[in-house]
Amino acid sequence: NIDVCKLGTVTVQPAPVIPLGSAANISCSLNPKQGCSHYPSSNELILLKFVNDVLVENLHGKKVHDHTGHSSTFQVTNLSLGMTLFVCKLNCSNSQKKPPVPVCGVEISVGVAPEPPQNISCVQEGENGTVACSWNSGKVTYLKTNYTLQLSGPNNLTCQKQCFSDNRQNCNRLDLGINLSPDLAESRFIVRVTAINDLGNSSSLPHTFTFLDIVIPLPPWDIRINFLNASGSRGTLQWEDEGQVVLNQLRYQPLNSTSWNMVNATNAKGKYDLRDLRPFTEYEFQISSKLHLSGGSWSNWSESLRTRTPEEEPVGILDIWYMKQDIDYDRQQISLFWKSLNPSEARGKILHYQVTLQEVTKKTTLQNTTRHTSWTRVIPRTGAWTASVSAANSKGASAPTHINIVDLCGTGLLAPHQVSAKSENMDNILVTWQPPKKADSAVREYIVEWRALQPGSITKFPPHWLRIPPDNMSALISENIKPYICYEIRVHALSESQGGCSSIRGDSKHKAPVSGPHITAITEKKERLFISWTHIPFPEQRGCILHYRIYWKERDSTAQPELCEIQYRRSQNSHPISSLQPRVTYVLWMTAVTAAGESPQGNEREFCPQGKAN
């Protein structure tokens, strides 16, 4: 709001730009015939200091010289870096009601001389790019500072460009707009940056470079891969490069990987054969280029090429298991199960499995293909049967995996000993065992198999199993293990033509059951009482039930109840007790116990035995 200094002038000594820590004198003078009307002696000049348009100080007390009614000089000190505005105003003291009138103003800039620019770095992107240099300007000057970038080279080549820094923009990079060509590859160039502002100037040290030092090739483009004879492991990577490139770096990795495979290729001319790819795998490929074997810089990495390698026929063998059940007097149902191949073995999308069931002596063969990982057939109970399964993708099939169908628990002498199951954590059970004591034939392998002790269908709920080498006596089972569920675990010892097994129950975590068994009936037979019950529903068991307890006491008695503890067997749902007095009414109830504790009691039943005392 300063009205172009109609009333007077403001001047600064030594200058409107001063170094940090310096003082300045500001003089405010009225023009002739300007001032307070009628009473020139009543002219009072005041100086106001503004920072960021905010009044911060009235410098009334800083007057160092005063020509009453005409001019005043003020000394200002301790100015902070940057720009400060000073406004001179005229105060006519005979008129208290009128505010002071602006006379004129001045901006004082406080700053520092520029430091010599450092760390000059120049690049030319691509053979056809232009030279651009960047530098470190040093401390902020708080003043408008001009920078000049000068380049000199062979054949009197000179070139310069300028830019400036102030409080709105920073100048630390300039593009000279000239192109250095490969025919100047051996020549030396010198660049220097000079900085100038109102407080001084400085120059960088000269920075010397050659064409090879600064030219960064453009990243390769148009990357593609050609798989030889649709091979999943061999491919030729092709790309376009600038003409002078002599060295390439290739990097590639499967998409879910965290480490790159790196390859250096000399004089590749846009082509390189890769031989170690994994079939049917999503890969990412990138390429970088360099113009000289020893000197120069690598280009940025190219854009990624993402592609999937073709399929190859599956390798590896399927992990097969089976279940055998007699379904009538001379037939058995064989359910075969197998685990999917892992991706490195499948080497493609598995389209189907080829299943063969063969009777060894009569040469009867049943064959089928299925897309599922199980297959069931009804076959005669007689004969020695063998099964094989192979996996097929679009390129071929894996070698068939064979398994002899034997009576898995048929040979007592092959039953493993001292089987135990310990919960390791929420989703693991450690199973340990000792080898069979008197096996007729050598154990070829152990199979640890587990199923939840919950009703399930045979094929919708296939078994879970682990194959264990014959010299191992433990297995940590974790697949499909959930807390608070009891599992029946079998350890099978298999020889060439026989099998023996031992069972145990185990859980990974347990709580006391939610409820006790429900007593359904109490019957008296031959002076004994038979207690019948229904088992606790599976979701309420909360782990493996170790035993049931039957409690009884005389009705209305305050004495502690008697109890009978029976080992839990799913097949058992009644138990006799024989220590009750005849013609006495008893109250009976049951509880269930897991390793975590006892359930609340189940329903109470009253009963009065009629028989003779035992």
């Epitope: 059940q325 299925t370 045979i458 094929t459 919708k460």
Partner: nanobody, 119 residues
């Protein structure tokens, strides 16, 4: 528990056809494979056919090509279409399903439906 109820039996002439039905109720969440068995007078009960949840079927050799097992999961039902019936097919036909708890197989049976093939 699972309950099974058969129907559709009767008297039919040799060469004729019958369609047996079996409906499951109760704890059927774990039902998968469904079976038909038969028991002729004075003989042991024998397997006839079964079908899996994925509609894969298997038959007794002597009925293969004449009998067809099918299922309707929405109705919890399984069917046995019997064509070209022979006198030796005369038997009580039973519906069956099996559940596994741990390694123990629990079997559930219907009460049976009589099929008589006679001229």
């Amino acid at each position: 528990q699972v309950q099974l109820q058969e129907s559709g039996g009767g008297l039919v002439q040799p060469g004729g056809s019958l369609r047996l039905s079996c409906t499951a109720s109760g704890s059927i969440f774990a039902i998968d494979d469904m079976y038909w068995y038969r028991q002729a007078p004075g003989k042991q009960r024998e397997f006839v056919a079964y079908i899996t949840a994925t509609n894969s079927a298997n038959y007794l050799d002597s009925v293969n090509g004449r009998f067809t097992i099918s299922r309707d999961n929405a109705k919890n039902s399984v069917y046995l279409q019997m064509n070209s019936l022979k006198p030796e097919d005369t038997a009580v036909y039973y519906c069956n399903t099996k559940q596994i708890v741990g390694f123990q197989i629990d079997e559930y049976w219907g009460q049976g439906t009589q099929v008589t093939v006679s001229s």
